[in-house]
């Protein structure tokens, strides 16, 4: 059974992940983002089901395309810098949260999503899990 300290650690990691995802979302919605139109054309895969920490496998697999889409906006006029480091941090948190013992094959929904829908979906996931822990 999870101890109160492990639950607290999980909660803090989820809060960190939540903040990182919200930071990306705020960054791409920035009116100075010259590549937003282009970014919105990219289709991301969404999880068929995302109710448990192990389902973060579906987020992990889409982090590489997310990094490359965000890479488009690396310019002086756009404040979301160091995409590589940000995605790397998210990756570390995701790996810790989902655990490496089970390599679940991710099941994706048939419908794809824009970067905004994709980020909102995972933000909602974090908020939902956090609420069950508190």
């Amino acid at each position: 059974a999870p101890t109160s300290s492990s639950t607290k650690k999980t909660q803090l990691q989820l809060e960190h992940l939540l903040l990182d995802l919200q930071m990306i979302l705020n960054g791409i919605n920035n009116y100075k983002n010259p590549k937003l139109t282009r970014m919105l054309t990219f289709k991301f895969y969404m999880p068929k089901k995302a109710t448990e920490l192990r389902h973060l496998q579906c987020l992990e697999e889409e982090l590489k395309p997310l990094e490359e889409v965000l890479n488009l906006a690396q310019s002086k006029s756009f404040h979301l810098r160091d995409t590589k480091d940000l995605i790397s941090n998210i990756n570390v948190i995701v790996l810790e949260l989902k655990g490496s013992e089970t390599t679940l094959m991710c099941e994706y929904a048939d419908e794809t999503a824009t970067i905004v829908e994709f980020l909102n979906r995972w933000i909602t996931f974090c908020q939902s899990i956090i609420s069950t822990l508190t």
Epitope: T41, E61, P65, Y108
Partner: antibody, heavy 118, light 107 residues
């Protein structure tokens, strides 16, 4: 880590067919298209066609229409490219490469040499 | 079908030089262009996607620019490992098409 591993070299007679495989690992096979590109010795890269492993949809370059077939087996994350009615001009290294929308071809197989000789 | 014309077809340069390779599309392709490097006996490697974006792991001396029909790949300061053949690829529409390649040789 992402890997595309292709089958070994083949020697075929003119008129025969060849089937090259491309086994994907390190990612969900159905989330990226598989493209096939060939290169004759000392020549440039030539795009042959693509396949969406999720739907099985394909698209071929006009030059290969009717001679090429691209298929997949999702249970073993493997794509196949079969080229029929082989002629000497088909002697080349055949590559598979994964692609997704405008990200281009980010990972490539190691290449499979197909030699067509009588 | 879209034709991609690359120039020059070959180029001699020295370590430390700044080098530019051009690719021209027969019709507008927006930003849908990638650049690839190929060394003898090896598979090509992606250098640039979406005309100007650098994938992680690619040295920053490589840069891409352009949109529509005119594109360039620039290597700001040639390194010994950069001597190879470079190809552009349009991924705007099917059939995909490559430029004929630019062989970069040591002067």
């Amino acid at each position: 880590q992402v890997q595309l591993v292709q089958s070994g070299a083949e020697v075929k007679k003119p008129g025969a067919s060849v089937k090259v495989s491309c086994k994907a690992s390190g990612y969900t096979f159905t989330t990226y298209d598989i493209n096939w590109v060939r290169q004759a010795t000392g020549q440039g890269l030539e795009w042959m066609g693509w396949m969406n492993p999720n739907s099985g949809n394909t698209g071929y370059a006009q030059k290969f229409q009717g001679r090429v077939t691209m298929t997949r087996n999702t249970s073993i994350s493997t794509a196949y490219m079969e080229l029929s009615s082989l002629r000497s001009e088909d002697t080349a290294v055949y590559y598979c490469a994964r692609g997704r929308q405008w990200l281009g071809f980010d990972y490539w197989g190691q290449g499979t040499l197909v030699t067509v000789s009588s | 079908d879209i034709q991609m014309t690359q120039s020059p077809s070959s180029l001699s340069a020295s370590v430390g030089d700044r080098v530019t390779i051009t690719c021209r599309a027969s019709q507008g392709i927006g930003d849908d262009l990638g650049w690839y490097q190929q060394k003898p006996g090896k598979a090509p490697q992606r250098l640039i996607y979406s005309a100007s974006s650098l994938p992680s792991g690619v040295p920053s001396r490589f840069s891409g620019s352009g949109s529509g029909t005119e594109f360039t790949l620039t290597i700001s300061s040639l390194q010994p490992e950069d001597f190879a053949t470079y190809y552009c690829l349009q991924h705007n529409s099917y059939p995909r098409s490559f430029g004929q390649g630019t062989k970069l040789e040591i002067r």
